[in-house]
Interface confidence: low
């Protein structure tokens, strides 16, 4: 019968020739009257048998994660007869892998939108890279991630990849980060290889600002001869969020006299303050109203940053006009 | 360590006034929305007021607005409590406690101080 | 504003013993948005849960929090001594109100 044991060979070998194992039958007793063949993908190419021994050889360099075995067939045969001493067999020779190849990520570009404010542990993205090398082969594809870039903002869990936030961030002061990962093969230990990545994260806004006027005191005219439903002025308010969470309603807080009112142009976000009754210089020649700003949709977890919503004092001064 | 100490507590007459403080060490006071909240003997837990990190807003319980003012001085690490016009229901512990990073619920909190009012 | 009310007012248990504490919304509390507190005479409260569920840094595995809208319940799955205290739900989706308190004391 056929004897031999498993057979390896490490890839990338740069020796011209490399012995692999022997492969002989147990009816050879050693005076070269046997002789070996190899054949299948890769015999005479890549790999040699001694063919009075049995001795196979590795004659070219190999790379396992182009090719990590090879199903090679073996004969032995009588030189004196030219007849088979055993049956044709198969064999297997397996490729082992070295670390050649460094993680690399195959998704990027990454990106990723969290809310500003998001509390220390929320997760962001998972950034996953791969390693071409054996997963089973030691530590050659095992993954280490960690932060280059986006302390202290950002962490990532070595083992998984996975993005979270380590220190709430405000969108109103910076909008975006960039964040590096490196994932290191070998677990980190020494000889390993890595690859980088780079992640875009965007802060998307919610509602922790109010709006606030931009003076406190408005001073607004009105002619006495003003019909109902007048414009008088405008007032407005800004507010540090955006989109949605910047839209404001403007509304009278205080105004005894019932002769004003305050609409929103939801379009300019500004405050129009309209005549609700007319007016009479002889009467009153002057009013004195405080308004009241808040945003239009405020989450309730979000409400106390919008308590004691801001106000503005409004001085409207009544014009004369002659009478006939 | 990460603590908060408060003081300032003492007896006092109804209609008197009394200024707490709570001194922060340990964590980044400026970046903490801050609060007051009481404990009157032998009774539940009495939310009185918040002030923001960097002091811009300030918002009170009903049964306080107009006689309590909060402030925070972010260079000394450190929160007050103004009490004027006392009142007796105004008796009880009072504790200065930390709202989260997240915000809005407190994991920090002093070992409190007493405040009586008392003819 | 929001009025939580905690049962039993008192809980007597022994060592070991499962001990479930209820708190009872006037009304939906947002987002989960409640907490629990442990308070030991003459001490500070300690937070044990916040978001429902959620347990804080420390808090033993044997405290958890459950519930949504306006019943939510606190499970303490045994009882160690050093557990016996007085524990407070907290709503703080808007403002802030606190619970009148359960007290765990020793059977």
């Known amino acids: 019968g056929w004897v031999w044991n498993q057979f390896f060979v490490p890839e990338e070998m740069n020796t011209t020739s490399h012995h692999i194992g022997q492969l002989r039958s147990d009816l050879d007793n050693g005076n070269n009257s046997f002789q070996y063949k190899l054949l299948g993908a890769g015999a005479g190419s890549t790999f040699i048998i001694d063919e009075r021994t049995g001795d196979i050889y590795a004659i070219q360099k190999l790379d396992r994660e182009e090719r990590s075995l090879y199903i090679l067939r073996a004969q032995v045969i009588d030189i004196a007869t030219g007849r088979a001493v055993e049956p044709e067999s198969e064999f297997v020779i397996k490729v082992s892998d070295i670390n050649d190849n460094e993680p690399k990520f195959l998704d990027e570009p990454y990106e990723a939108i969290v809310p500003e404010m998001s509390p220390e542990g929320t997760l962001v993205i998972q950034v996953t890279a791969s390693d071409a090398d054996d997963p089973s082969s030691g530590n050659n594809a095992r993954l280490l991630y960690s932060l280059l870039q986006g302390q202290p903002y950002f962490s990532v869990e070595p083992t998984t990849g996975v993005i979270r936030i380590s220190s709430k961030m405000d969108r109103e002061l910076q909008d975006e980060y960039w964040v590096i990962i490196q994932a290191k093969d070998m677990i980190g230990q020494p000889g390993a290889l890595s690859g980088t990545t780079s992640v875009l994260i965007k802060l998307s806004d919610v509602n922790d600002n109010k709006p606030i006027f931009k003076e406190s005191l408005y001073r607004l005219t009105v002619s006495e001869s003003a019909p109902t439903g007048t414009s008088i002025g405008t007032i407005m308010a800004y507010d540090n969020d955006i989109g949605e969470n910047a839209e404001m309603d403007y509304s009278i807080e205080e105004d005894d006299s019932q002769t004003f009112d305050i609409i929103t142009n939801h379009e300019t976000q500004e405050g129009i303050v309209i005549l609700k009754k007319k007016v009479d210089f002889e009467h009153q020649n002057h009013y004195g109203i405080r308004a009241k700003v808040k945003n239009h949709h405020v989450p309730e977890q979000l409400m106390k940053y919008h308590t004691e919503a801001s106000t503005t004092f409004i001085k409207i001064q009544v014009e004369d006009v002659d009478e006939p | 360590q990460v603590q908060l100490v408060e003081s300032g507590g003492g007896v006092v007459q109804p209609g008197g006034s009394l200024r707490l403080s709570c001194a922060a060490s340990?964590?980044?006071?400026?970046?903490?929305?801050m609060d007051w909240v009481r404990q009157a003997p032998g009774k539940g837990l009495e939310w009185v007021a918040v002030?923001?990190?960097?002091?811009?807003?300030?918002y009170y319980a009903d049964s306080v607005r107009g006689r309590f003012t909060i402030s925070r001085d972010n260079s000394k690490n450190t929160l007050f409590l103004q009490m004027n016009s006392l009142r007796v229901e105004d008796t009880a512990v009072y504790y200065c406690?930390?709202?989260?990073?997240?915000?809005?619920?407190?994991?920090?909190w002093g070992r409190g101080t007493l405040v009586t009012v008392s003819s | 504003e929001i009025v939580l009310t905690q049962s039993p007012g008192t809980l007597s248990l022994s060592p070991g013993e499962r001990a479930t504490l209820s708190c009872r919304a006037s009304?939906?509390?947002?987002?989960?948005?409640l907490a629990w507190y442990q308070q030991k005479p003459g001490q500070a409260p300690r937070l044990l849960i916040y978001?429902?569920?959620s347990r804080a840094t420390g808090i033993p595995d044997r405290f958890s929090g459950s519930g949504s809208g306006t019943d939510f319940t606190l499970t303490i799955s045994r009882l160690e001594p050093e557990d016996f205290a007085v524990y407070y739900c907290?709503?703080?989706?808007?403002?802030?109100?606190f619970g009148q308190g359960t007290k765990v004391e020793i059977k």
């Open positions: 406690a930390r709202e989260t990073g997240e915000g809005w619920y407190f994991d920090l």
């Open positions: 340990g964590f980044s006071f400026s970046s903490y929305d």
């Open positions: 002030i923001w990190y960097d002091g811009s807003n300030k």
């Open positions: 009304q939906s509390v947002s987002s989960s948005y």
């Open positions: 978001g429902a569920s």
């Open positions: 907290q709503q703080y989706g808007s403002s802030w109100t």
